[in-house]
Interface confidence: low
């Protein structure tokens, strides 16, 4: 008995060939001996089977002695043994229809699990192997699970179902919903405008949800909600914003926040959460703000940074075009009795300058000027 594998929703063509290369009488029946279709001369006739409206043949092939049975929009329950009766012979074809679906939506939040479920006919014992877009292989039986989805899992998953040494391939498009970056740091001089951007790593036609930015200032004992907003079809509308600081938010994607001034009291870490409609769980992006201030008070030139800095970052004070006068892995450095000239305060990581603030020290009889 010939075995043919089909995919749910697809069309399958079961072949039946006569030895005579001409149009002769034939019938296709199911295992219950119910007629599906046949011919009466050059006319196609259909029996009362459940395939009635989905069964067809190719009349153009009849003259060549070929009498195919075409079944459209395959269903799992179409799995059956089909019998072609032609020239007093019976040809049997076993059709096995499989379906592979993502249990949840195919749009999943980063960190969520993807479960692929194989629908298969009773009595079959298929094996499934799926390959993710990043080349990871997973194997299983009726269900396959991938926990902790990552951004790189977005794309087309290719799954191969194997049964009776035959195989059928499924392709499922998975979209992992996440921000492009899990975390970001913004370095700013005191008084500068701060731009926070939260680009998404996916595109969908309609995006609806709500979000909030919670902020933990370094100087504060507890975190505070800075802004809440709604997202409707990619349009952003602010629901509530604190008076201090008074953040501004862009009306379009990507999500964009503006802090009018970087001040030491704002330095710290924020967590932007985005809850999408019809999704359980939230998208998260951490954002950090580091603020630098250079000041001269009487005979003391001081440079300070506030916010989440790594212990390996170096803070330096140097006179322009000269060697650093002071350089420490600390959040404040100072020089007593600085000589006149343009001083630079630098925050650097392995020689790469992250943040720079200049302060002009005038001769002792005048007051300092900040450019």
């Amino acid at each position: 008995k010939k075995v043919v594998l089909g995919k749910k929703g697809d069309t399958v063509e079961l072949t039946c060939t006569a030895s005579q290369k001409k149009s002769i009488q034939f019938h296709w029946k199911n295992s219950n001996q119910i007629k599906i279709l046949g011919n009466q001369g050059s006319f196609l006739t259909k029996g009362p089977s459940k395939l009635n409206d989905r069964a067809d043949s190719r009349r153009s092939l009849w003259d060549q002695g070929n009498f195919p049975l075409i079944i459209k929009n395959l269903k799992i329950e179409d799995s059956d043994t089909y019998i072609c009766e032609v020239e007093d012979q019976k040809e049997e074809v076993q059709l096995l229809v499989f379906g592979l679906t993502a249990n949840s939506d195919t749009h999943l939040l980063q960190g969520q699990s993807l479960t692929l479920t194989l629908e298969s006919p009773p009595g079959s014992s298929p094996s499934v192997q799926c390959r993710s877009p990043r080349g990871k292989n997973i194997q299983g039986g009726k269900t396959l699970s991938v926990s902790q989805l990552e951004l790189q899992d977005s794309g087309t998953w290719t799954c191969t179902v194997l049964q009776n040494q035959k195989k059928v391939e499924f392709k499922i498009d998975i979209v992992v919903l996440a921000f492009q970056k899990a975390s970001s740091i913004v370095y700013k001089k005191e008084g500068e405008q701060v731009e926070f951007s939260f680009p998404l790593a996916f595109t969908v036609e309609k995006l609806t949800g709500s979000g909030e930015l919670w902020w933990q200032a370094e100087r504060a004992s507890s975190s505070k909600s800075w802004i809440t907003f709604d997202l409707k079809n990619k349009e952003v509308s602010v629901k509530r914003v604190t008076q201090d600081p008074k953040l501004q938010m862009g009306k379009k994607l990507p999500l964009h926040l503006t802090l009018p001034q970087a001040l030491p009291q704002y330095a710290g870490s924020g967590n932007l959460t985005l809850a999408l409609e019809a999704k359980t769980g939230k998208l998260h992006q951490e954002v950090n703000l580091v603020v630098m201030r250079a000041t001269q008070l009487q005979k003391n030139l001081t440079c300070e940074v506030w916010g989440p800095t790594s212990p390996k970052l170096m803070l330096s004070l140097k006179l322009e075009n000269k060697e650093a006068k002071v350089s420490k892995r600390e959040k404040a450095v100072w020089v007593l009795n600085p000589e006149a000239g343009m001083w630079q305060c630098l925050l650097s990581d392995s020689g790469q300058v992250l943040l720079e603030s200049n302060i002009k020290v005038l001769p002792t009889w005048s007051t300092p000027v900040q450019p």
Epitope: P48, K50, N52, D53, E77
Partner: antibody, heavy 120, light 107 residues
Framework: QVQLLESGPGLVKPSETLSLTCTVS????????WSWIRQPAGKGLEWIGR???????NYNPSLKSRVTMSIDTSENQFSLNLSSVTAADTAVYYC??????????????WGQGTTVTVSS | DIQMTQSPSSLSASVGDRVTITCQAS??????LNWYQQKPGKAPKLLIY???TLETGVPSRFSGSGSGTDFTFTISSLQPEDIATYYC?????????FGGGTKVEFK
């Protein structure tokens, strides 16, 4: 045994919106299509549309522009809204379960029906 | 939409009579046809599906036949409790459509 009960106002003013709710008891709202059918007095049955647990809907094209259906799985209820009603919308409104099985697709469980009159 | 034309719209018969109702579809609907019974003030009840299959618990005096566009519903021996309106309904296509109904009453 699954039972359906329609509820909603019996009188609606012309141009207003007719709102009905169907409560499913004795079974789950999952895995079935749930439909609304109406019958003007002394006349035949008209299928209005149906809704699935996912919220997906199919409406009769003749009413599509005025019909909205919704489903609340937590309350085991589904609803019908018919806007801009006229006297022609006066009818008995039924909710029903659409059941599918081999060789079979039919409305196997029906509510008792609720009479809605459109009048000022 | 598929139009379902039922005839007659009403008929009078006596207990024990054989009653036949026909239903014609505006296009081929294969066997996708149901027959419902509706008693006054009640919701319809499914009697026959797939044109000819009797729903569980329905008396065998009810039968259905036909396929394609022409269908027949028969009550082999009319009983008092069969006084009702009978509707055919196609499920080949959405929207689901019903015939106009046949009212069966006593002579």
């Amino acid at each position: 045994q699954v039972q359906l009960l329609e509820s909603g106002p019996g009188l609606v003013k012309p141009s207003e919106t007719l709102s009905l709710t169907c409560t499913v008891s004795g079974g789950s709202i999952s895995s079935y299509y749930w439909s609304w059918i109406r019958q003007p007095a002394g006349k035949g049955l008209e299928w209005i549309g149906r809704i699935y647990i996912s919220g997906s809907t199919n409406y009769n094209p003749s009413l599509k522009s005025r019909v909205t259906m919704s489903i609340d799985t937590s309350e085991n209820q589904f609803s019908l809204n018919l806007s801009s009603v006229t006297a022609a919308d006066t009818a008995v409104y039924y909710c029903a379960r659409e059941l599918e099985r081999p060789y079979y697709y039919g409305m196997d469980v029906w509510g008792q029906g609720t009479t809605v009159t459109v009048s000022s | 939409d598929i139009q379902m034309t039922q005839s007659p719209s009403s008929l009078s018969a006596s207990v024990g009579d054989r009653v036949t109702i026909t239903c014609q579809a505006s296009q081929d609907i294969s066997n996708y046809l149901n027959w419902y019974q509706q008693k006054p003030g009640k919701a319809p009840k499914l009697l026959i599906y797939n044109a000819s299959t009797l729903e569980t618990g329905v008396p065998s005096r009810f039968s259905g036949s036909g396929s394609g566009t022409d269908f027949t519903f028969t009550i082999s021996s009319l009983q008092p409790e069969d006084i009702a309106t009978y509707y055919c309904q196609q499920y080949d296509n959405l929207p689901l459509t019903f015939g106009g109904g046949t009212k069966v009453e006593f002579k």
